[in-house]
Interface confidence: low
């Protein structure tokens, strides 16, 4: 009811002689602050005095009197809500009831707390889960109803007396609700922990033993089995007997059923701890184990591999890899079921024994075409020799071999001929599917491996072919050796180096760039007339009459080729000059007379000079001298001189006669 003070604290606190007690406590007074506090040990109410009698362990009054016991007992509270107490050290005779006498200005209250102090440290308590199964993690809890700030303790876990490796988590509680120290250990027990003793040991701060609690682990687990076999090596021959025995080394709870398995499959009607196999066959080879079950589940023994030995079965050959490329490596594997494994092998290539090959594998580091064929083997063990199986085929692939380019034409080949070539090879695997030719040209391939060159050129020198399957093999180039008439025939002047002047020594050369065959003949021609048959045409002293159009011809057995016409030009001073007169050499006065200086010159005359009968040069320099009107005084002998870059020439005298006209005669 509302007339009560409100207190909160643990109902009973536990400790032992020499330890300490920490009493967490809170309160709420009815009115105002606390004025007086007395801590009684086993208080009793005296009706006569209306007061409490008993040992006063602590007193806090207005006058401030404090008993000597107050050093051991401490009030750690305050005047309105905290009533926490500490007794350190605590003694056996402190057991009993503690009474907290509280007084405020107008109200009084007695609060009772039980204290249980034992002579020696009391043991902690181990709490286990209801069931423990192997390999399943469990939490082991060790609980001690004690905790005090002034007295540190520790809880340690031991398994069969040895500290456990797993890390424990320790927690303490010092609250108005509870006071305890707790250690929790997470642990995955194995079947071998069954029946083992687990201890929780209480120790002081120095690790000194104070007390402990122990439990025996009850670890539920599947049966643990040992399998024994006779003969011990589990190796027998067909027709022998085998005995296997299953021993249970541990089971919790007790086992209920037993069975035998071969290669993971249960054997029917085999439900005892002994398995007898009589007159075994090779099919009974395999992995045997026994299986025993209990309520937790089935346990299996280790497997025993029973080997029923027999001679090798017919062998097969595995090839890595076929088809194989020439030059690559190939491995052959002889596969034969046998027990024990074959110790010796005989290998055959195309039915013929391969010497020195006795291993399960044959490795050929560099395959050649002749390695192709059928490979077979025979396996042998201590029980006998197997049969030769069908064998495996090795296909060796390689580029075409010995490729040649062959000219089909009769020789020699002439420029303009049609040439046929064929591409031949010795062997190929896989088959040749195409051909290539070098150099490339707009040529016909009328059939596979044949090349037709229409109108073969003079400069078609060599041709090479390749035969191709997955790879291309090139033949050495073959020379066509095309024959042709001389080419690029031309006339070349060797001397003189400069222009040809009349009287010079002149040499002309007949040149050509090439000819096949090389043997040639030369012909020189001028105006259709044969001049010579040497490569050079020589003039010791050239004359203007030698000028003209010259050609040379070069012949070989294939044909003849002419040069372009070459013009020979001879330079000479004006010659054969003469003065011609028009209309004639007799002219009537008053008329017109034209004198022309005619000449032969190369280059043409560039400058004329006229002279009279007195060798007096006239002021006229053109080819024609025109006299108009002509006078009688003009009568006389005239001559002319012509000049070109080579020199000068003069004409003989020509006489002009000018006669009087009838009119003049009439006047006389």
């Amino acid at each position: 009811d509302s007339s009560k003070w409100v207190f909160e604290h643990p109902e009973t606190l536990y400790a032992w002689e020499g330890a300490c007690v920490w009493i967490p406590c809170t309160y709420r007074a009815l009115d105002g602050d606390l004025e007086s506090f007395i801590l009684f040990h086993n208080p009793e109410y005296n009706k006569n005095t209306s007061k409490f009698d008993g040992t006063r362990l602590y007193e806090s009054t207005k006058d401030g009197k404090v008993p000597s016991e107050q050093k051991r007992v401490q009030f750690l509270g305050d005047k309105n809500k905290n009533c926490t107490l500490s007794i350190h050290p605590v003694h056996l005779n402190d057991s009993g009831q503690l009474g907290l006498r509280m007084e405020s200005k107008t109200e009084k209250w007695m609060e009772r707390i039980h204290l249980n102090v034992s002579e020696r440290p009391f043991p902690p308590h181990i709490q286990l889960p209801p069931e423990i199964q192997e390999s399943q993690e469990v939490t082991l809890t060790c609980l001690l109803n004690f905790s005090c700030y002034g007295y540190p303790i520790q809880l340690q876990w031991l398994l069969e007396g040895v500290p456990m490796r797993q890390a424990a988590v320790t927690s303490t509680s010092l609250t108005i609700k509870s006071v305890f120290t707790r250690s929790e250990l997470k642990f995955s027990p194995q079947w071998s922990h069954h029946g083992k003793i687990v201890t929780c040991q209480l120790q002081d701060a120095d690790g000194k033993f104070l007390s402990n609690d122990t439990v025996q682990l009850n670890v539920k687990h599947t049966p643990k089995l040992e399998i024994k076999v006779t003969p011990s090596d589990a190796i027998v021959r067909e027709g022998d007997s085998v005995t296997m025995t299953c021993e249970v080394s541990s089971s919790n709870p007790e086992y209920t059923t037993v069975s035998w398995l071969k290669d993971g499959t249960s054997l029917k009607k085999q439900n005892t701890f002994t398995l007898n196999l009589r007159e075994v066959t090779k099919d009974q080879s395999g992995k045997y184990c026994c299986q025993v079950s209990n309520d937790v589940g089935p346990g299996r023994s280790e497997e025993v591999f029973l080997q029923v030995q027999y001679a090798p079965e017919p062998s097969t050959v595995q090839i890595l890899h076929s088809p194989a490329v020439e030059g690559s490596q190939v491995e052959f594997l002889c596969m034969s079921l046998a027990n024990p494994l074959p110790t010796n092998y005989t290998w055959y290539h195309n039915g013929k024994e391969m010497q020195g090959r006795t291993e399960e594998k044959v490795h050929i580091p560099k395959i050649l075409p002749w390695h192709a064929g059928t490979y077979s083997c025979v396996a042998e063990n201590i029980l006998g020799t197997g049969q030769r199986g069908p064998g495996a085929e090795l296909d060796v692939q390689y580029p075409p071999k010995k490729v040649t380019t062959v000219i089909q034409n009769p020789m020699p080949i002439r420029e303009g001929d049609t040439v046929t070539l064929s591409c031949n090879y010795n062997s190929s695997n896989p088959s040749v599917t195409r051909y290539e030719w070098k150099p490339h040209g707009a040529w016909e391939e009328p059939s596979l491996g044949v090349l037709k060159i229409q109108n073969v050129g003079w400069d078609n020198t060599t041709i090479a072919c390749a035969a191709c399957n997955s790879w291309c093999s090139w033949a050495s180039p073959v020379a066509l050796n095309v024959q042709y008439a001389p080419r690029d025939v031309r006339v070349r002047k060797i001397k003189p180096l400069s222009e040809i002047h009349s009287g010079n020594s002149v040499s002309l050369q007949c040149d050509f760039s090439s000819s096949h065959p090389k043997e040639v003949q030369f012909f020189w021609e001028k105006n259709g007339r044969l001049l010579g048959k040497e490569s050079q045409l020589n003039f010791d002293s050239i004359s203007p009459e030698d000028a003209g159009s010259y050609s040379c011809w070069v012949n070989n057995s294939i044909g003849q080729t002419a040069s372009k016409a070459w013009t020979l030009e001879v330079l000479y001073a004006p010659r054969r000059l003469r003065v011609s007169m028009s209309p004639g050499d007799q002219v009537m006065e008053g008329k017109s007379a034209t004198l022309t200086c005619e000449s032969d010159a190369n280059p043409p005359v560039s400058h004329y000079t006229w002279f009279d009968w007195n060798n007096q040069s006239l002021p006229y320099h053109s080819q024609k001298l025109r006299l108009e009107p002509v006078k009688v005084q003009h009568s006389g002998a005239y001559w002319c001189q012509g000049t070109n870059s080579v020199g000068k020439g003069r004409s003989p005298l020509s006489t002009l006669t000018v006669y009087y006209s009838p009119e003049t005669i009439g006047r006389r």
Partner: nanobody, 125 residues
């Protein structure tokens, strides 16, 4: 085929420790027991210890009990021989071996199908 490679051997003082490792490769599915053997100069090869494929069963020779233990790492296909308190008489070449067929008689060296090349352990006094 199973290939075995031992490692971890060396020179150690008496009272010291070593850990040998045996790495298995190849057809490791068919392994049933992995064993350790040793051979001192001029002596027969002798059984040291064995561990079953499941890890359920271990055997140790009397001469090494309490000093040597065998463990394994399934993920790595490796078995270990932990050797403590080594003595000069433990000096030998240590071999790792494999039984393919799971015979119960694990101490007999003739029952082991595959062997490693060995690793030298020398214990000096």
């Amino acid at each position: 085929q199973v290939q075995l490679v031992e490692s971890g051997g060396g020179l150690v003082q008496a009272g010291g420790s070593l850990r040998l490792a045996c790495a298995a490769s190849g057809d490791t599915v068919s392994i049933y027991y992995m064993g350790w053997f040793r051979q001192a100069p001029g002596k027969e090869r002798e059984f040291v210890g064995a561990l079953s494929a499941s890890g359920q069963f271990t055997d140790h020779a009397d001469s090494v009990k309490g000093r040597f233990t065998i463990s394994r790492d399934d993920a790595q296909n490796t078995v270990f021989l932990h050797m403590n308190d080594l003595k000069p008489e433990d000096t030998a070449v240590y071999y790792c071996a494999v039984q393919r067929y799971g015979w119960v008689y694990r101490t007999d060296k003739t029952m082991y199908n595959y062997w490693g090349q060995g690793t030298q352990v020398t214990v000096s006094s």
